[in-house]
């Protein structure tokens, strides 16, 4: 008789992260017999959907099907056909869709309805598309990074070398920056969480966690830029906005209607004597930083201490993983190294922002000009948010670890979301690890 390789006893899961600027599909894989072990789920594929975020399809929902096709077809290729019907698919939409829902619940529902119909056509076990809350986004990001870092288990981890190795079981805090919102989540040290909205209680693997989380809607990097422009154009004497957050020589025409399209700029809205204005970059980090600080209201705090806009924030505690756009922006700027101090980061940002636009374009020819033009703002915004918004200091800066992936899995909320929805994080520590039967006939 012929020796046949026994089929791998594995399971798969798919999560689509429908963010404000784009959608990404993640495929996860794990050994079927070890579902309740910590650290066994890993990412096998990321497929970035080509095009904008799903909220941009509000006027052309007929294009959502074609938009999702390529990545869903990719999932069909990656996951063995025999597993298709039992592979769950989840879509979570974040702040871009939260903003659309604020504008019109009906339009948001229409987009989600078409997304659901499109995803239902595939041979997987589609579990639904929904807008997750900011609190969920923060919590699942925190779960993801701590799961991947092996923080939830006393047992030996399944991988040998953990980056950011700390020999204790102290969890990492999570800092997530998107296009439309930003989340901060961590376990404070013996501190009462004064605002119930920001408190989460978890029991994971037999241990209790009291977690602080907050999601700042409109403070993702893209919406923060719209806010800054709306604020600054109020005091511009004409339709020229000399902007320190863009490189010298950079010019861009902005439609006032686009500026006021988002709910995030409503507080700055006013009748302007022009339909368009031109941004003219002057590339000055210090002035850019000052302009950004005006977006944070620090004059009012009904608690013992706040981040900004009257939102409670306990004293920072422990190490933090900063991911998503925190990582992408800092990686582009070559500022993710643990050896780079906060003072050095500031110095580098000053130099970067002062570089002429033509020079920047030549140096980074392969980067989309829209993104390229915004790195000065985004880098400055990250510094402002972390230092003045969340109260990191030059000393505590070294506790921020800019993380893209941990052991091959992207840092972000999607893994935590799937672990939760597939009940793969038990409340109690499993009594014993079941033996693997995959090697026996």
């Amino acid at each position: 008789t012929q020796n046949k390789a026994l089929p791998e006893n594995v399971k798969y899961g798919i999560v689509l992260d429908a963010g404000s600027s784009h959608t990404s599909l993640y495929i996860y894989k794990w050994p079927a017999e070890k579902e309740n072990d910590t650290g066994v789920v890993h990412q096998v594929e990321e497929c970035r959907v080509k095009g904008p975020g799903i909220s941009k399809f509000v006027q052309k929902v007929n294009e959502i099907g074609i938009y999702l096709t390529d990545c869903m077809e990719r999932a069909r290729e990656v996951i063995p056909r025999s597993q298709h019907q039992e592979t769950p698919v989840y879509l979570g939409a974040t702040a871009g869709m939260r903003l659309l829902r604020m504008e019109s619940e009906e339009l948001a529902d229409r987009v989600l309805d078409v997304v659901e119909r499109s995803l239902s056509n595939y041979p997987f076990d589609f579990q639904g598309a929904r807008i997750i809350t900011g609190q969920e986004e923060g919590a699942y990001g925190w779960i993801t990074i701590n799961y991947l870092l092996g923080k939830f288990s006393q047992k030996t981890r399944w991988f040998s070398i953990v980056p950011y190795e700390t020999n204790n079981q102290e969890t990492f805090g999570a800092l997530d920056l998107g296009g439309a919102s930003t989340q901060v989540t961590f376990v404070p040290q013996n501190q009462t969480i004064e605002s119930p909205d920001n408190a989460l209680q978890f029991r994971l693997y037999g241990k209790d966690y009291n977690v602080y989380t907050h999601s700042f809607l409109c403070y993702g990097k893209d919406q923060a830029l719209w806010q800054k422009l709306a604020k600054d154009i109020q005091v511009a004497s004409n339709e020229i906005l000399r902007d320190p957050c863009f490189h010298p020589g950079y010019k861009k025409v902005v439609n006032v209607s686009d500026l006021y399209k988002t709910p995030c700029t409503k507080r700055f809205e006013m009748t302007l004597p022009f339909q368009q204005f031109e941004i003219q970059g002057i590339g000055n980090y210090q002035q850019c930083h000052q302009s950004i600080l005006e977006l944070f209201n620090t004059s009012y705090c009904p608690y013992s201490q706040c981040a900004f806009n009257g939102i409670f924030l306990p004293p920072l505690q422990g190490d933090f993983g900063a991911f998503s756009a925190f990582y992408f922006v800092m990686k582009f700027l070559n500022l993710t190294s643990e050896k780079v101090s906060q003072e050095k980061v500031t110095e580098m940002m000053k130099k970067f922002c002062a570089q002429p636009w033509e020079e920047i374009k030549t140096s980074y020819a392969g980067v989309k000009e829209k993104y390229l033009s915004e790195y000065c703002f985004s880098g400055t915004y990250i510094l402002s948010l972390l230092l003045q918004g969340y109260h990191f200091t030059a000393d505590s800066w070294e506790h921020i670890h800019f993380i893209g992936k941990i052991q091959g899995s992207d840092a972000g909320w999607t893994l935590g979301y799937m672990l939760n929805l597939t009940n793969m994080i038990p409340a109690e520590q499993p009594l014993s690890t079941p033996l693997s039967h995959s090697t026996y006939v």
Epitope: G51, N62, I66, D70, S118, K368
Partner: antibody, heavy 119, light 109 residues
Framework: QVQLVQSGAEVKKPGASVKVSCKVS????????MHWVRQAPGKGLEWMGR????????KYAEKFKNRVTMTSDTSTNTVYMELSSLRSEDTAVYYC????????????WGQGTMVTVSS | DIVLTQSPALAVSPGQRATITCRTN??????????MNWYQQKPGQPPKLLIY???SLASGVPARFSGSGSGTDFTLTINPVEADDTANYYC????????FGGGTKVEIK
């Protein structure tokens, strides 16, 4: 705005290979599927294949499967199409093109590269 | 493979309606989306997208151009025709990679 600039005209002998480049400015090639289409003199458009520069994944038309190789270089934002074992009927204008991205209304094409195969 | 068949040539007077047809085998419909596009090509120039997803007008294209159809039968209509519309017109499917029709030569009388 997005622009696709292709390499210059080529004259090749039968049996030789040709490598045509297509440099994209104004956007990253990873945002698109990049296609190659050719057009023989006085004839219609013929699709040759595509590459997804995000993952270097390629799909080729059956007719060209054994002779064409498409590659990309994200550091220079350039895609390449190499056609081997050239014959006279490969004389054509070769175009690179982006696939229209859902949510946006148009696509982009290079200016075309004339490849002449003659002994 | 998906095969596209176009009417070969058409001569129209300015101000009149021009109708170009394209038949596909098999269908280019997929889960409720119709993957049919139309291009215009003038001599010495690359093709220019006119219509995508059977009936959506591409950016910057005059409203004189319209597309219709689903399944296997499609039409590109130019109404009214202008002298500048002299060109070759190609249908293209993008349901399963790309295939082009043979082209329709439109002449303005």
């Amino acid at each position: 705005q997005v622009q696709l600039v292709q390499s210059g005209a080529e004259v090749k002998k039968p049996g030789a290979s040709v490598k045509v480049s297509c440099k994209v400015s104004g956007d990253s090639i990873t945002a698109y599927f990049m296609h190659w289409v050719r057009q023989a003199p006085g004839k219609g458009l013929e699709w040759m294949g595509r590459i997804d520069p995000d993952h270097e994944r390629t799909k080729y038309a059956e007719k060209f499967k054994n002779r064409v190789t498409m590659t990309s270089d994200t550091s220079t934002n350039t895609v390449y199409m190499e056609l081997s074992s050239l014959r006279s009927e490969d004389t054509a204008v070769y175009y690179c093109a982006t696939e229209r991205v859902p949510g946006f209304e148009t696509d982009y094409w290079g200016q075309g590269t004339m490849v002449t195969v003659s002994s | 493979d998906i095969v596209l068949t176009q009417s070969p040539a058409l001569a129209v007077s300015p101000g009149q309606r021009a109708t170009i047809t394209c038949r596909t085998n098999p269908t280019v419909d997929h889960y409720g989306t119709t993957y049919m596009n139309w291009y215009q090509q003038k001599p010495g120039q690359p093709p220019k997208l006119l219509i995508y997803l059977a009936s959506s007008l591409a950016s910057g294209v005059p409203a004189r151009f319209s597309g219709s159809g689903s399944g296997t039968d499609f039409t590109l209509t130019i109404n009214p025709v202008e002298a500048d519309d002299t060109a070759n017109y190609y249908c293209q499917q993008s349901r399963n990679l790309w295939t082009f029709g043979g082209g329709t030569k439109v002449e303005i009388k």
